[in-house]
Amino acid sequence: SIPWNLERITPPRYRADEYQPPDGGSLVEVYLLDTSIQSDHREIEGRVMVTDFENVPEEDGTRFHRQASKCDSHGTHLAGVVSGRDAGVAKGASMRSLRVLNCQGKGTVSGTLIGLEFIRKSQLVQPVGPLVVLLPLAGGYSRVLNAACQRLARAGVVLVTAAGNFRDDACLYSPASAPEVITVGATNAQDQPVTLGTLGTNFGRCVDLFAPGEDIIGASSDCSTCFVSQSGTSQAAAHVAGIAAMMLSAEPELTLAELRQRLIHFSAKDVINEAWFPEDQRVLTPNLVAALPPSTHGAGWQLFCRTVWSAHSGPTRMATAVARCAPDEELLSCSSFSRSGKRRGERMEAQGGKLVCRAHNAFGGEGVYAIARCCLLPQANCSVHTAPPAEASMGTRVHCHQQGHVLTGCSSHWEVEDLGTHKPPVLRPRGQPNQCVGHREASIHASCCHAPGLECKVKEHGIPAPQEQVTVACEEGWTLTGCSALPGTSHVLGAYAVDNTCVVRSRDVSTTGSTSEGAVTAVAICCRSRHLAQASQELQGSTSGSGLNDIFEAQKIEWHEHHHHHH
Amino acid sequence: QEDEDGDYEELVLALRSEEDGLAEAPEHGTTATFHRCAKDPWRLPGTYVVVLKEETHLSQSERTARRLQAQAARRGYLTKILHVFHGLLPGFLVKMSGDLLELALKLPHVDYIEEDSSVFAQ
């Protein structure tokens, strides 16, 4: 039967219909920066070209004996996971390997940098189709390695990296912490985060998604027909590199931002048991397991959004945290969160010609996070409208007054240390959907966007009795762009988007009375783009055989059905 | 990439009159910074990536590398340029004593310097 990991990333309808995943990825070249590889292994023979690039340090220890099979082990297995004939994700992808890790699996930042430069120069000398670079390695946080990854990504290369196997915050490692890189954590057959000895997969806001990374069957360098099971975030990253190759082969014009959004969109949601992660990391870690899209048809019309968390601000009174979207994305809303509840809200502000989301800590607070909602909205023209704190008791309000602009998000920011909970909450008057409302002592910021065919609506879910969490979700066909709490009083810890659901967190019930002061309303702004839907329909009408859909249906195989285990 | 900017010795002589090479000091208010791996066992002292400001050309990178070598030699320190970066980031990889970091940070065009460190298969 099909290995569990390939079953897990295969869309359900193809498992049910017993279709083989496509010999996809044929238009894509995947660069692997790893150990040496056994290029004549049956799984990868003819699929992997070994470049002459080698930059590795001397092995440690005087009694170290180089054994070819050990030297090639890691890289051979990963090449097999990406493009192996039998156990590979993207069986049509061609690969190029660069040796940056020695026989002990150790390399240097400088060697990796020179390797990335080699790829860039190769790309300039001989431009090919889409490029994916797989970095199944990790070191400590490195400004220069992250910068090199950023430059390569901005040159149109998709970089996929291992989150790291240190059971730690991935933001402390590179290249995992580089925002432009797609960072992958590892899960097992039970959708649990992978444990590796006393350690395990990294986690946190720098992880983009998880993928199968335990007990992965792949090419073994022990012999040219051998297979072996390996585990780690490298294996998880190899799955995502394979999926990326498939997606890019079906849609070669996809940008990095579009690819990342699609990877997130087509992932299995909320299947990971978060109890494995440290408590303070659970909210920051994406509960996503990578999967192939069922089809590229129907993807184009979607308004894709993702949530980007900032680094923690730190506890000083005036500390702030900033969350940023990728260059090709639009910041459609901005929210904030503080575990202590002591915060002074958030606002969208221009920085280097682009909007960013800034959250403000308050006196006595342990720090805040800024949470950006980053979306793909072609031809968008977005601006922020601000209303200063109101004198009137009705609260502060601001709306989108420009013709054709719709409200995509609301933020509020206050200078006072504590918005009193004794003041009655202010609910937005009905029939005014393009309006943000907030506490009278807060300034309110409305994100207003004009884009072809963009339409948005506001959804609220209010709970009169105090509750630790209030949620409201957008329905099928609509995408969550904004998430905020009404009215944003001090017992509200903050608001953030999880997939298509707006989550508002409040202080522990035991610390809040059951009076009306405990009332919390979660406000979701849900949008869709009629323009994208039309463009997608036109595209489907004028093209044939270009989607993953068609590739999937090209070849049948007797695969036994395996059901996706959701916990 | 080979060195295209004239004889190394010429540069040594040209720098004789300069006080520690500060004739072309960094622009006012912009101080180059030094970074190293937070995980001590992963550090590789003695090898440094000198990253230059974004718009620095290859010839300027090579010139800056030679300037560092010349100034280091005048203090009795050896330096070896292992690579000159261009294409992704401007800069160079150098083997040198950590004693030279203060000097290197004052070189023109330098944005930051990072000590080399280990990476591992995951």
Epitope: V56, N102, I114 | Y8, L78, I81
Partner: antibody, heavy 121, light 107 residues
């Protein structure tokens, strides 16, 4: 054990080119720079330049800058030195040497056996 | 280029003699000097690095000293296998120049 093995003797005509190889074994080839030094008959040693095999970065003695090319092939742990537009005074033994680097001192700790290049019409 | 002037260019000595070879740099090279021994038809072998550090496996009768511009290689008690040519090298700046060599012959 660590060693550098060079290609055999060459006889060349003036104006021709010669390519000398230096095969490394017993250590990680990309971990050390390889230098080329020549010695004319009965004369002293003359440094020609070096290559960093891990990045192909090269640095040459100005005297040879326009005529010398240094390359490497990591798959066979071999460095090459090519000297073009040969003249009779290029007749010499050409050595490759591995450079060992410590914190603030370095030296050539391993040398090839030498390759005799004779330039004669 | 830095010129390394080695003297004498040749000397005759007997087994057991103390032999001193000097090298003078045309400019300050601090302690960036190495000494090599070369026998006829063979490649050079490292003896001393950084002016005064004896390389692994080199007999203790070989010692180096000096800094700046003046350097000395001393063989405290000449042995039969020490009859060879000795070269100094500066690594302070490129090109990494060598001395002209000192040939030590049997008296």
């Amino acid at each position: 054990q660590v060693q550098l093995v060079q290609s055999g003797a060459e006889v060349k005509k003036p104006g021709a080119s010669v390519k000398v190889s230096c095969k490394a074994s017993g250590y990680t080839f990309t971990g050390y720079t390889i230098h080329w030094v020549r010695q004319a008959p009965g004369q002293g040693l003359e440094w020609m330049g070096y290559i960093n095999p891990s990045s192909t970065y090269t640095k040459f003695n100005q005297k040879f800058k326009d005529r010398v090319t240094m390359t490497r092939d990591t798959s066979i742990s071999t460095a090459y030195m090519e000297l073009s537009r040969l003249r009779s005074d290029d007749t010499a033994v050409y050595y490759c040497a591995r450079e060992r680097i410590y914190s603030n001192y370095w030296f050539f700790d391993v040398w090839g056996q030498g390759t005799t290049v004779t330039v004669s019409s | 280029d830095i010129v390394m002037t080695q003297s004498p260019s040749s000397l005759s000595a007997s087994v057991g003699d103390r032999v001193t070879i000097t090298c003078k740099a045309s400019q300050n090279v601090y302690t960036a000097v190495a000494w090599y021994q070369q026998k006829p038809g063979k490649s050079p072998k490292l003896l001393i690095y950084s002016a005064s550090n004896r390389y692994t496996g080199v007999p203790s009768r070989f010692s180096g000293s000096g800094s700046g511009t003046d350097f000395t290689l001393t063989i405290s008690s000449l042995q039969p296998e020490d009859f060879a040519t000795y070269f100094c090298q500066q690594l302070s700046s490129q090109p990494e120049t060598f001395g002209g060599g000192t040939k030590v012959e049997i008296k």
